[in-house]
């Protein structure tokens, strides 16, 4: 049966026993800045082009052993959530991956900047259709990273990022705090904010909306046909990147402001239990869970 | 041809630039009242001291970015410091990424075209 997260973002009209918008997101290219990925996994084969971009720090620890499946784990799962054949949101979207996170899931602001610059240069050299950039990462507040995101957004690129998994104000993190970026928090099957160990999803005025981010089934790099459940604001951001790809594929001329407005408009309102957030953040945190547009847009979104 | 040469001629190039700016009024030093600022990650364990993103003012051309980077290297070398330019940014933001001692920050902040400098820091998969 349909995974809970795909059911949650699907308008009631489409809730059959399967989720299959036939060509969702086919006009859009989604860039993923993350770990390396297993690009020939059955769930994503042919959908992800691995660019030659790589800018990662050395792994910590003298006894660290690079295990390919672990190195690829985070990125493979997210690529599957965005465009996977069976568990993906935008099954028609094509993706390009840039490696900015090492085998321990760690990167640098500078490496991310160089990655964003690479995307801009690629866009200038070979202009294609709409671009979505997924940044499933977070660091401390960074003026320069936010500035780079602003410039890329002004060049017509849609940037989607994880709010962060620190159970904290997203405005203290980047790129989550960049105003031009669509910042996504994580909710679970009960529409509760996601708890991750002692921490959980970030919140606050820098979050634009929430999306499913707990127990999300997606491609596992353990084997070419494996699936695994992962949780985090990265998974939530991947859902919104997929939804954005479908919206832009249906309406390629949408501006960032219009897309943001549509994402908010079609979200489920006031379903999140705000008691989870600190009292002073409740009024600042948007009570919105991302969803695809309803059946009135059938011809646009499910062509 | 001299403009294209790197480190060895850096001091000479600086001198030429200084003289030229005196002659034709080109303001190569920071304008009065616009002091470049330094930023670093508020979360100490995530800081990566020793690597800095030098962000230049918005309309700075690539050639000026390269020249500013070489100028920093030359001034640092004069003070006995080794520096390494890791990347020159253009396309999104003008600037460069430099590996250097934090002792040189004051010097770098005074370079022409500099808007701000940010110490590199870590980002993490979420």
């Amino acid at each position: 049966s349909i995974p809970w997260n795909l059911e949650r973002i699907t308008p009631p009209r489409y809730r059959a026993d399967e989720y299959q918008p036939p060509d969702g997101g086919s006009l859009v290219e989604v860039y993923l800045l993350d770990t390396s990925i297993q690009s020939d996994h059955r769930e994503i084969e042919g959908r992800v082009m691995v660019t030659d971009f790589e800018n990662v720090p050395e792994e910590d620890g003298t006894r660290f052993h690079r295990q390919a499946s672990k190195c690829d784990s985070h990125g493979t799962h997210l690529a599957g959530v965005v465009s996977g054949r069976d568990a993906g949101v935008a099954k028609g979207a094509s993706m390009r991956s840039l490696r900015v996170l090492n085998c321990q899931g760690k990167g640098t602001v500078s490496g991310t900047l160089i990655g964003l610059e690479f995307i801009r240069k690629s866009q200038l050299v070979q202009p294609v259709g709409p671009l979505v950039v997924l940044l499933p990462l977070a660091g401390g507040y960074s003026r320069v990273l936010n500035a780079a995101c602003q410039r890329l957004a002004r060049a017509g690129v849609v940037l989607v990022t994880a709010a962060g998994n620190f159970r904290d104000d997203a405005c203290l993190y980047s790129p989550a705090s960049a105003p031009e970026v669509i910042t996504v928090g994580a909710t679970n099957a009960q529409d509760q904010p996601v708890t991750l160990g002692t921490l959980g999803t970030n919140f606050g005025r820098c979050v634009d909306l929430f999306a499913p981010g707990e127990d999300i089934i997606g491609a596992s790099s353990d084997c070419s046909t494996c699936f695994v459940s992962q949780s985090g604001t990265s998974q939530a951001a991947a859902h919104v990147a997929g939804i954005a790809a479908m919206m832009l594929s249906a309406e390629p001329e949408l501006t960032l402001a219009e897309l943001r407005q549509r994402l908010i408009h079609f979200s489920a309102k006031d379903v999140i239990n705000e008691a989870w957030f600190p009292e002073d953040q409740r009024v600042l945190t948007p009570n919105l869970v991302a969803a695809l547009p309803p059946s009135t847009h059938e011809n646009l979104y499910f062509q | 041809g001299a403009m294209g040469q790197e480190d060895e001629d850096g001091d000479y190039e600086e001198l030429v630039l200084a003289l030229r700016s005196e002659e034709d009024g080109l303001a190569e030093a920071p304008e009065h009242g616009t002091t470049a600022t330094f930023h670093r990650c508020a979360k100490d364990p995530w800081r990566l001291p020793g690597t800095y993103v030098v962000v230049l003012k918005e309309e700075t051309h690539l050639s000026q970015s390269e020249r500013t980077a070489r100028r920093l290297q030359a001034q640092a070398a004069r003070r006995g410091y080794l520096t390494k330019i890791l990347h020159v940014f253009h396309g999104l933001l003008p600037g460069f990424l430099v590996k250097m001692s934090g002792d040189l920050l004051e010097l770098a902040l005074k370079l022409p075209h500099v808007d701000y400098i940010e110490e590199d820091s870590s980002v993490f998969a979420q």
Partner: antibody, heavy 115, light 109 residues
Framework: QVQLVQSGAEVKKPGASVKVSCKAS????????ISWVRQAPGQGLEWMGW????????NYAQKVQGRVTMTTDTSTSTVYMELRSLRSDDTAVYYC????????WGQGTTVTVSS | QSALTQPASVSGSPGQSITISCTGT?????????VSWYQQHPGKPPKLMIY???NRPSGVSNRFSGSKSGNTASLTISGLQAEDEADYFC?????????FGGGTKLTVL
């Protein structure tokens, strides 16, 4: 254009081994693995397994597990399928195909097992 | 014994429409969006006609269409032409592998 070119026909004795090659071109190799499919005379298609062009990982069908080895040589963009302990019912046309989606096929390699 | 069940043969006259069924279980056809259909002429390798239940690769005529309901997938060929005479195979993902149907011989009368 996207192409898979296979090695020529083979005649083998029972108990022997055969190694069939498949050279890929015209697409980013790491974005797809290679599947191997065989077809006995007058019969249907049988999936034998898959190999990753990205990391060399394999996924073999239970029926041939233990007798088949798939390998890849990234320097020449060539994938190999070796079948050991051949029996007469291994007589078939062996195809390589791109990925699990099998959207592009090689021309086929006839392997005859006969004493 | 093939994992997916197809009729051994179907036939139709030029211009007619025919449908070939492919029945599996919830562990293959019913559980995945990845049902494919292949056309094979004698002595030739199979050619992909439909992928992911209902998508046509570029270059394949729009006379070919695919659908799925529950554990059964279907290939429909409309406006039958002489060159459509061939063997047709369906395939599906399973949890760890791939399975094919036994094949259907299409005769154009």
């Amino acid at each position: 254009q996207v192409q898979l070119v296979q090695s020529g026909a083979e005649v083998k004795k029972p108990g022997a081994s055969v190694k069939v090659s498949c050279k890929a071109s015209g697409y980013p190799l790491t974005s797809y693995g290679i599947s191997w499919v065989r077809q006995a005379p007058g019969q249907g298609l049988e999936w034998m397994g898959w190999i990753s062009a990205y990391n060399g990982n394999t996924n073999y069908a239970q029926k041939v597990q233990g007798r088949v080895t798939m390998t890849t040589d990234t320097s020449t963009s060539t994938v190999y399928m070796e079948l050991r302990s051949l029996r007469s019912d291994d007589t078939a046309v062996y195809y390589c195909a791109r990925g699990y989606g099998m959207d592009v096929w090689g021309q086929g390699t006839t392997v005859t097992v006969s004493s | 014994q093939s994992a997916l069940t197809q009729p051994a043969s179907v036939s139709g006259s030029p211009g007619q429409s025919i449908t070939i069924s492919c029945t599996g279980t919830s562990s293959d056809v019913g559980g995945y969006n990845s049902v494919s259909w292949y056309q094979q002429h004698p002595g030739k390798p199979p050619k992909l006609m439909i992928y992911e239940v209902s998508n046509r690769p570029s270059g394949v005529s729009n006379r070919f269409s695919g659908s799925k309901s529950g554990n059964t997938a279907s290939l429909t060929i409309s406006g039958l032409q002489a060159e459509d005479e061939a063997d047709y195979f369906c395939s599906s993902y399973t949890s760890t592998s791939m399975v094919f149907g036994g094949g259907t011989k299409l005769t154009v009368l």
